[in-house]
Amino acid sequence: LIIGFGISGRHSITVTTVASAGNIGEDGILSCTFEPDIKLSDIVIQWLKEGVIGLVHEFKEGKDELSEQDEMFRGRTAVFADQVIVGNASLRLKNVQLTDAGTYKCYIITSKGKGNANLEYKTGAFSMPEVNVDYNASSETLRCEAPRWFPQPTVVWASQVDQGANFSEVSNTSFELNSENVTMKVVSVLYNVTINNTYSCMIENDIAKATGDIKVTESEIKRRSHLQLLNSKAS
């Protein structure tokens, strides 16, 4: 969490941003909140990006003002106009690109004063893994697949029964480039699995960590997946 203040004490307002990550090809949110004002027409929101000459987005006098918007953001940004009055200056970003990564500044002017806060925005690709029993294999084998990751992640297998065991000798992981030539499909195979055990396939890069669990018993197979973004710090 980053909390910024205006330059001169009495005329400063608190602006708060949260570091976040964008999944390329999808929509992203750059979070920013501020002390609200009672009049929408008195609020100015400016989003800027370090190293970019034009504005990312500007909202003032109750409407978007995009005449100074940088080329790389054209047609790709929007504020939540109905929530500005309650102090939400968050920015929606369409079709996140790798090049959108960087340091952003959320700069606010209201009748109470000015304030700003920076936000670190990481971009990459991350997706939920799915673990299945590979019935085509000669021995009991598990297959963990996740369709989109970037940068290349690490894959680690773990087991509830054999806690702390190193499965690198009995697993094989491959990375297959997807058609857009950036993200990759992750496939990891674990051999010699035993029943009545829960196995976890953990995929991690510097942006996200995802886990796919599978519990294999005589009578049933249970699956569970979850994904967590790393380094979501408020500022």
């Epitope: 929509d27 978007d64 003002e65 995009l66 918007q69 054209r74 047609g75 790709r76």
Partner: antibody, heavy 119, light 107 residues
């Protein structure tokens, strides 16, 4: 309320140029992009180009060499020029405004102006 | 270019019927799909934007759903004024593209 009005249509000879205008009211050209879409008689919709609030443009690659869009914010008008017209450019030409700045759909359309390319 | 394939291309139905039109994108377009209604000699009218958001003033019998590559426009109970041609369009990447249209006729 938001309004877009196209003008400049009519009969144009093959090989000649066409200049259309789209006069807007009820919103500012510094807040929203304006799209151009055409529809040949009895056919579907075809997106041609957009001019953004900043004045930058994006074109359908199929028309890149023949199209130019510009605007005059003070006159609330967008201009559309297409060169080297051929018979297959005969269509109703529409200008339209996005529903949001992030372009999720075209909310407001002009009435359209018919361009007939014929000798 | 992203192809938007609409089906069916034409459809006969009666007042009160529930009608579904589908649109399939040749690659993922997120939720950047909109639906339009067009009557002869008139400009298209926006019904749904962002795949599922009903535009201001559009009757609640119109609804949209889908994300990724598969999208649906549903008219829950056809009214006489709904007989028209419907188009889907994507605004995810350039060039923006439209489906070929679905002509909805009275049975």
């Amino acid at each position: 309320q938001v309004q877009l009005v196209e003008s400049g249509g009519g009969v144009v000879q093959p090989g000649r140029s066409l200049r259309l205008s789209c006069a807007v009211s009820g919103f500012s050209l510094t807040s929203y992009g304006v799209q151009w879409v055409r529809q040949a008689p009895g056919k579907g919709l075809e997106w041609l180009a957009v001019i953004w609030s900043s004045g930058s443009t994006d074109y359908n690659a199929a028309f890149l060499s023949r199209l130019t869009i510009s605007k005059d914010n003070s006159k609330n008008t967008v201009y559309f020029q297409m060169n080297s017209l051929r018979a297959e450019d005969t269509a109703v030409y529409y200008c339209a405004r996005d529903v949001t700045t992030i372009v999720e759909g075209f909310a407001h359309w002009g009435q359209g102006t018919l361009v007939t390319v014929s000798s | 270019d992203i192809q938007m394939t609409q089906s069916p291309s034409s459809l006969s139905a009666s007042v009160g019927d529930r009608v579904t039109i589908t649109c399939k994108a040749s690659e993922k377009v997120g939720t950047y799909v909109s639906w339009y209604q067009q009557k002869p000699g008139k400009a298209p009218k926006l019904l749904i934007y962002g795949a599922s958001n009903r535009y201001t003033g559009v009757p609640s019998r119109f609804s949209g759903s889908g994300s990724g590559t598969d999208f649906t426009l549903t008219i829950s109970s056809l009214q006489p004024e709904d007989f028209a041609t419907y188009y889907c369009g994507q605004t995810y990447s350039y060039p923006f593209t439209f489906g070929q249209g679905t002509k909805l006729e009275i049975k």
